[in-house]
Interface confidence: medium
Amino acid sequence: PRSIDVKYIGVKSAYVSYDVQKRTIYLNITNTLNITNNNYYSVEVENITAQVQFSKTVIGKARLNNITIIGPLDMKQIDYTVPTVIAEEMSYMYDFCTLISIKVHNIVLMMQVTVTTTYFGHSEQISQERYQYVDCGRNTTYQLGQSEYLNVLQPQQ
């Protein structure tokens, strides 16, 4: 079998809401993946599991099942949404994200995604990790790749 390539493209959109009384930020982050099937037979994308970390803490998880079938030598772009919550020990971020005096409230999040594909009863898992900028101060739609955080080191939060 040839490879199945998974490429994390980036954040497509981030929709934010707040709970002032709970000092809580709710971020619905939609991400985009390109999955390429380099085989001469179809493969099934069985599931996508994703999680988002802020400052080494998991703030959101998602799992999509029975997603799609990718034909031979074909590529599909898949969007998946991870609902995240920044609260409690991280409630100090509420003040930053709602600060009116600054226009952009970028925070660095680590996106982790694992794609499970199956073909002829065989299962394969491919994982990716990327740091991304997300604006926690407003609803934002990104050009693909626009939210990339290029520093390969663990960011200081």
Epitope: S17, Y18, D19, V20, Q21, K22, Y26, E88, T98, I100
Partner: antibody, heavy 121, light 112 residues
């Protein structure tokens, strides 16, 4: 119906500790935060802090940081507040109150029966 | 900390008349989302406090519509029209915009 049943009155000596309980019934305990409020005779109400029973996360009024310890037992749907190093100023009625509602609409909608703590030598 | 002030410690009132209880905060309780984070509670003699008003002007479930809340960012009023004997007790305002939550000193409503 939704109820918060608090433990009975406590009589304690200065320097001692007491542990007050607040048993929740009629709702899903882990879905709501539990706050504690102090009422001294002839004085107003003071907010002590809260616990999120789901995660165990606590937030305290700085004034009570070294005085009160909030815990919760999910298996018995009970919130606890331990008061340590008691002084006469700790003599008061202590209330637990549930913070209920929905996103951006939270309020103290249910209050416990109150526990009277008397510190006396 | 935000300081909540209730200027009148007690308020004598005749049944059937209207009364206003005032409360001030040392900082605006009006959030940028348009909500004003102020509660009003009533503590009847020998009872636990009960919620009357949340977010400055919203009537809590089961509370008679004789009660109403109003105000600006720092000055608030609880109005009781047609006071009844069961309305006696101590009325507290409380801010829940910022931690620590803070209460006013209370206003005791007494029947003349």
């Amino acid at each position: 119906q939704v109820q918060l049943q608090q433990s009975g009155a406590e009589l304690a000596k200065p320097g001692a500790s007491v542990k007050l309980s607040c048993k929740a019934s009629g709702y899903t305990f882990t879905n709501y935060w539990m706050h504690w409020v102090k009422k001294r005779p002839g004085q107003g109400l003071e907010w002590i802090g809260y616990i999120n029973p789901s995660s165990g996360y606590t937030k305290y009024n700085q004034k009570f940081k070294d005085k009160a310890t909030l815990t919760a037992d999910k298996s018995s749907n009970t919130a606890y507040m331990q008061l340590s190093s008691l002084t006469y100023e700790d003599s008061a009625v202590y209330y637990c109150t549930r913070e209920g509602g929905s996103i951006s609409d939270w309020y103290f909608d249910v209050w416990g029966t109150g526990t009277t703590v008397t510190v006396s030598s | 900390d935000i300081v909540m002030t209730q200027a009148a410690p007690s308020l004598p009132v005749t049944p059937g008349e209207s009364v206003s209880i005032s409360c001030r905060s040392s900082k605006s309780l009006l959030h940028s989302n348009g909500n004003t984070y102020l509660y009003w509670f009533l503590q009847r003699p020998g009872q636990s406090p009960q919620l009357l008003i949340y977010r400055m002007s919203n009537l809590a479930s089961g509370v008679p519509d004789r009660f109403s809340g109003s105000g600006s960012g720092t000055a608030f009023t609880l109005r009781i029209s047609r006071v009844e004997a069961e309305d006696v007790g101590v009325y507290y305002c409380m801010q829940h915009l910022e931690y620590p939550y803070t209460f006013g000193g209370g206003t005791k409503l007494e029947i003349k």
